[in-house]
Interface confidence: low
């Protein structure tokens, strides 16, 4: 009967509003990975953040945010035992809570930042479970009981292994894109210099070329100060 209730709960949650709380459960002492999917086009060029809700109606206190340079959002940034990384092409923000402890439990938000504003991508309830006695099936997932206020909570049993020190994940699509762009820019710069030398023309007068870097039409790669005029 309980697995049936869980299935109904999950089904109802998927049909309901965008900001229902998603429950992520992790085991004390282990790492927990929280994923926040989002529309990569809608949030193109925006940095992301992970914040902790202070009370039911209180402010959301920033824990960690992605790299200041949006193009480098794939780089994992740490604040204490919490890490954040963003696959901007795939549209997935991933937060890792290492060495989960009772004090990590609580209500959080994945946010998309624009200026001083922040859009909520997902509300997340992190729960810290005791060590499992054995490997349990989906029927054993916790769902809100009679004393809980998260009637529409969606449960994600995201218990992940501990990350090894210095472990480097496989590069997401965004890093591959960045490398490709840098490579293209270098080729274009070399071509420009070669053409200028060939035609006896000053490099500064070469007509600028649009650079799309392989993304969907209409979405230009932002020109960053560090990459300009290479």
């Amino acid at each position: 009967m309980e697995p049936l209730r869980l299935l109904i709960l999950l089904f109802v949650t998927e049909l309901s509003g965008a900001h229902n709380t998603t429950v992520f459960q992790g085991v004390a002492g282990q790492s927990l990975q929280v994923s926040c999917p989002y529309d990569s086009m809608k949030h193109w060029g925006r940095r992301k953040a992970w914040c902790r809700q202070l009370g039911e109606k209180g402010p959301c206190q920033r824990v960690v945010s992605t790299h200041n340079l949006w193009l480098l959002s794939f780089l994992r940034r740490w604040n204490g035992s919490t890490a954040i990384t963003d696959d901007t092409l795939g549209g997935t923000l991933t937060i890792t809570l290492r060495n989960l402890q009772p004090h990590d439990a609580g209500l959080y938000q994945c946010q998309s930042l624009h200026g001083s504003e922040a859009d909520t991508l997902r509300k997340v309830l992190v729960e810290v479970l005791a060590d499992p006695l054995d490997h349990r099936d989906a029927g054993d997932l916790w769902f809100p009981g009679e004393s809980e206020s998260f009637e529409d909570a969606h449960v994600e049993h995201s218990i992940s292994r501990s990350l090894l020190e210095g472990e480097i994940p496989f590069p997401p699509t965004s890093i591959l894109l960045l490398l490709a762009c840098i490579f293209l820019i270098k080729i274009l710069a070399a071509s420009a210099l070669w053409a200028a030398a060939w035609h006896g023309q000053k490099p500064g007068t070469h007509p600028p070329s649009e650079l799309d870097c392989g993304h969907d039409p209409g979405y230009q790669l932002q020109t960053l100060p560090g990459l300009r005029d290479t």
Epitope: Q101, P102, P132, R136, G145, S147
Partner: antibody, heavy 126, light 107 residues
Framework: QVQLVQSGAEVKKPGASVKVSCKAS????????ISWVRQAPGQGLEWMGW????????NYAQKLQGRVTMTTDTSTSTAYMELRSLRSDDTAVYYC???????????????????WGQGTLVTVSS | EIVLTQSPATLSLSPGERATLSCRAS??????LAWYQQKPGQAPRLLIY???KRATGIPARFSGSGSGTDFTLTISSLEPEDFAVYYC?????????FGGGTKVEIK
């Protein structure tokens, strides 16, 4: 009202095992965990571990790992704590307490121990 | 593990006086700290949780304060039934630990 009633005093020989029970009433048993705390004569309180009555998950204090087993019987709303290979320094009053809730959530209120059982004196003596 | 040090070990006061009990953590526990009262031959009773929130049925003369590593339990005016041993407990990190206790005795 919420109540935890523990089993009676026990006298055991070194090397033996003891199993203390804790019967809960007045609340939905599976919505909470049961924690176990012991207190040696004239000493302070020592946390032994906790079990989720919802799914049987446990966390034990490292120093007792391998000697202690906590279980629950949801049909009778009873929690059990078994301690094996008893030594004289295991002589203590053993308390059960309600809490935390079945999973840690929110701020400290989720993990408070309230209420407590009346305690079970376990004497280990040859 | 987090070590909680309570001071003083014994506090000798008269009824009506103010009692101030201290609990210091070996590392920050934020506000994840509770206080319990224990009378001889009885089980502990929850007084304060989240460092400063009074548990149900606890009189207003009991108050808790502090965060991080330093915490205080204050009994504004001691009643005869308040003479007991008081323990602090951190619920921030496993293993959950208790302080050594402060005995409040009649002067």
């Amino acid at each position: 009202q919420v109540q935890l009633v523990q089993s009676g005093a026990e006298v055991k020989k070194p090397g033996a095992s003891v199993k203390v029970s804790c019967k809960a009433s007045g609340y939905t048993f599976t919505n909470y965990g049961i924690s176990w705390v012991r207190q040696a004569p004239g000493q302070g309180l020592e946390w032994m571990g906790w079990i989720s009555a919802y799914n049987g998950n446990t966390n034990y204090a490292q120093k007792l790992q391998g000697r202690v087993t906590m279980t629950t019987d949801t049909s009778t709303s009873t929690a059990y704590m078994e301690l094996r290979s008893l030594r004289s320094d295991d002589t203590a009053v053993y308390y059960c307490a309600r809490g935390p809730t079945k999973a840690y959530y929110g701020s400290g209120s989720y993990v408070v121990f309230d209420p407590w059982g009346q305690g079970t004196l376990v004497t280990v003596s040859s | 593990e987090i070590v909680l040090t309570q001071s003083p070990a014994t506090l000798s006061l008269s009824p009506g006086e103010r009692a101030t009990l201290s609990c210091r953590a070996s590392q920050s526990v934020s506000s994840y700290l509770a206080w319990y009262q224990q009378k001889p031959g009885q089980a502990p009773r929850l007084l304060i949780y989240d460092a400063s929130k009074r548990a149900t049925g606890i009189p207003a003369r009991f108050s808790g304060s502090g965060s991080g590593t330093d915490f205080t339990l204050t009994i504004s005016s001691l009643e005869p039934e308040d003479f007991a041993v008081y323990y602090c407990q951190q619920v921030s990190l496993f293993p959950l630990t208790f302080g050594g206790g402060t005995k409040v005795e009649i002067k």
